[in-house]
């Protein structure tokens, strides 16, 4: 999916008002210095591509983020403010229902959510030069 035509300001507002808080809740009890940010993004569409991938694609050691509150809200924001995104999710949603897993917070998941926090912060500062 190409995130170029999303309403970035509305997605940013949703992040600031609610998604960010859910990410913090998920990470509660973890030191902010515990994980190094290894995933980066260069512009808003690229950031959303990386955010979508890290949030919804199962990875080794962390297969359960999609059912977290921040993930549900991310999915809603993309479906509402990214033209045509919801259509791409119809088959994906049906497939996800079949492979629903119980929520388990592993260290790998905490690291992944830490990366997500970094991607979202970068999404909110699109004019900053990539370091």
């Amino acid at each position: 999916y190409d995130f170029t035509n999303c309403d970035f300001e509305k997605i940013k507002a949703a992040y600031l008002s609610t998604i960010s808080k859910d990410l913090i809740t998920y990470m509660s009890g973890t030191k902010s210095t515990e994980f190094n940010n290894t995933v980066s993004c260069s512009n808003r569409p690229h950031c959303l591509t990386e955010i979508q991938s890290l949030t919804f694609n199962p990875t080794a050691g962390c297969a359960s983020l999609a059912k977290e509150m921040f993930a549900m809200k991310t999915k809603a924001a993309l479906a509402i403010w990214c033209p045509g995104y919801s259509e791409t999710q119809i088959n994906a949603t049906q497939a996800m229902k079949k492979r629903r897993k119980r929520k388990v917070t592993t260290n790998k998941c905490l690291e992944q959510v830490s990366q997500l926090q970094g991607l979202w912060r970068r999404f909110n500062r699109p004019l900053l030069k990539q370091q």
């Epitope: 035509n5 509305k10 609610t18 809603a76 509402i80 403010w81 033209p83 045509g84 259509e87």
Partner: antibody, heavy 120, light 107 residues
């Protein structure tokens, strides 16, 4: 079963406001956005805007921006649409309709409609 | 905003006949089109979503097709309860818009 029950008919004077309610039951309120659609007598359907309980935010058709306010009370699973500065052209049936925001993504259940008549 | 134009405005057919309703979008909207049926004094009822996805409880004589800008709702054999107004709607981007409507009436 899923039900959206709207408030009763209203007769209003030009320049006044109207607030229509839509009480939802039979599903998890925060899993769905609540859209508002109006239909003038003998005319087609016009999307006014939506409230997304999961994100606590609303979005509007620019044609109604500033005049329409869409809100919800999550504790009672009730959505509201307030339209101000009413004029005769606002005489219409107003519908609420739910739409999944993490699945389905379509207006699959509608309220029965609320007739608002604007007349001096 | 995305404009949806439905044709014909009115379709006069007899029970048992096939009805073909068209919806054309002013720009590419992939398959983000849904079809509704509305009878006098009633709220719209969802028939087909995302161009061709069927809804449980809707008779299988209703089917949808199309993508991009051109979409079609087909009623294979009209029953007496099918005479109504049909609307297409796009959810590709805000503001959501509805088509102008096609009235299917008894010939």
């Amino acid at each position: 079963q899923v039900q959206l029950v709207q408030s009763g008919p209203e007769v209003k004077k030009p320049g006044s406001s109207v607030k229509v309610s839509c009480k939802a039951s039979g599903y998890i309120f925060t899993d769905y956005a609540m859209h508002w659609v109006r239909q003038r007598p003998g005319q087609g359907l016009e999307w006014m805007g939506t409230f997304i309980p999961l994100l606590d935010t609303s979005d509007y058709n620019q044609n109604f921006k500033g005049r329409a306010t869409i809100t919800a009370d999550k504790s009672t699973s009730t959505a509201y649409m307030e339209l101000s500065s009413l004029r005769s052209e606002d005489t219409a049936v107003y519908y609420c309709a739910r739409m999944g925001v993490t699945h389905s993504y379509v207006m699959d259940a509608w309220g029965q409609g609320t007739l608002v008549t604007v007349s001096s | 905003e995305i404009v949806l134009t439905q044709s014909p405005g009115t379709l006069s057919l007899s029970p048992g006949e096939r009805a073909t309703l068209s919806c054309r979008a002013s720009q590419h909207i992939s398959r983000s089109v849904h079809w509704y049926q509305q009878k006098p004094g009633e709220a719209p009822r969802l028939l087909i979503y995302f161009a061709s996805q069927s809804i449980s409880g809707i008779p299988d004589r209703f089917s949808g097709s199309g993508s991009g800008t051109d979409f079609t709702l087909t009623i294979s054999r009209l029953e007496s309860e099918d005479f109504a107004v049909y609307y297409c709607q796009q959810s590709y981007s805000f503001p959501y818009t509805f088509g102008t409507g096609t009235k299917v009436e008894i010939k």
